[in-house]
């Protein structure tokens, strides 16, 4: 159960959650593994049970407090260990000194809504969720619009290089159904990555007035 290529990756959501994924080729599906968290300057220790998410990968969330509580800072280091049971003993499979603000992945944006829609344009707003006040305005967004007959993967990415929680989509086709998604990323952190995409927001442009284009 320990011979395959392994990978251990964790991200901090900037508030009170560290999410980890442990993957190992050739590991048995019923292998019992945990993530242990040992901070350098906090009184708590945390453990979470790694649960299977696919044939060779397991995931768990270290819940450090209430969703909007600020549990870690940029000077914290949390040693994270993957421990797997082998018979009667536990074996360490991976270890890292985790710097939370070097490994950020925020929650997906929420509360997407259509502020105003016309025949050729649509104004959409959203909110960020459980994001640290430490970022102030140092966030960027990516957005994409799903047009009829296309896939999300084909949708061109629109980049907002500042903390702007709205967008005005233009050059849309009248009386057409669209979907919209957005994701967020802090500017801080060597290993920081994009949040998951938001839930899609469906909207329809207004039909063109009779006798007009």
């Amino acid at each position: 159960a320990v011979n395959g290529t392994s990978r251990f990756t964790c991200f901090y959501n900037s508030r009170a959650n560290i999410s980890c994924v442990w993957s190992q080729d050739g590991a048995l599906q019923d292998t019992s593994c945990q993530v242990h968290a040992w901070p350098d300057r906090r009184r708590w220790n945390q453990t979470c049970e790694l649960l299977p998410v696919s044939q060779a990968s397991w995931a768990c969330n270290l819940i450090l407090g209430t969703p909007d509580s600020q549990k870690l800072t940029a000077v914290d280091i949390v040693t994270l260990r993957v421990m797997c049971r082998e018979g009667v003993r536990w074996r360490m499979m991976a270890i890292q000194d985790f710097k939370p603000f070097e490994n950020l992945r925020l929650m997906a944006p929420i509360s997407l809504q259509v502020v105003h829609v016309e025949t050729h344009r649509c104004n959409i707003s959203w909110k960020i969720s459980q994001a640290s006040h430490y970022f102030e305005r140092h966030l960027e967004f990516e957005a994409r619009t799903l047009s009829p007959g296309h896939t999300w993967e084909e949708a061109p990415l629109m980049t907002l290089k500042q903390k702007q929680e709205w967008i005005c989509l233009e050059t849309l086709t009248p009386d057409t159904q669209y979907e919209f998604q957005v994701r967020v990323k802090p500017l801080q952190g060597e290993f920081t990555t994009w949040s998951p995409w938001s839930q899609p927001l469906a909207f329809r442009t207004k039909p063109a007035a009779l006798g007009k284009d």
């Epitope: 251990f8 990756t9 350098d40 280091i77 040693t79 991976a94 710097k99 290993f191």
Partner: nanobody, 126 residues
Framework: QVQLVESGGGLVQPGGSLRLSCAAS????????MSWVRQAPGKGLEWVSS????????YYAESVKGRFTISRDNDKNTLYLQMNSLKPEDTAVYYC???????????????????RGQGTRVTVSS
């Protein structure tokens, strides 16, 4: 680009001590696990020791456990290997190595080594 420059090697008698240093540049040193590997004359690369990014976890090959100590100074971007009670079989070129992430995998300690230096030669002989 990543640069790793080892120093501190030399000729030492059996039972003696040496301290190797590795000056790192071109990356955020404290974000990465680091290790020492060695290559004895006519042999392949052998993993010696590893340390996590903040130095909270240290790991050793059985052949050096209790004699060698790995450490790091993140303010100086420097990795160290203190070698005591040296034996003739410790004779090798010692390389400082950087992992490809902050993660170290104890069951497969050489996994993920991405860069290494030019090496410093250690000879243990009377």
């Amino acid at each position: 680009q990543v640069q790793l420059v080892e120093s501190g090697g030399g000729l030492v008698q059996p039972g003696g001590s040496l301290r190797l240093s590795c000056a790192a540049s071109g990356f955020t040193f404290s974000n990465y696990a680091m290790s020492w590997v060695r290559q004895a004359p006519g042999k392949g690369l052998e993993w010696v020791s590893s340390i996590t990014g903040a130095g909270r976890g240290t790991y050793y090959a059985e052949s050096v456990k209790g004699r060698f100590t790995i450490s790091r100074d993140n303010d100086k971007n420097t990795l160290y290997l203190q070698m005591n009670s040296l034996k003739p079989e410790d004779t090798a070129v010692y390389y400082c190595a950087k992992y490809d992430s902050s993660t170290f995998y104890p069951p497969t300690p050489a996994r993920g080594i991405a860069d290494r230096g030019q090496g410093t030669r250690v000879t243990v002989s009377s």
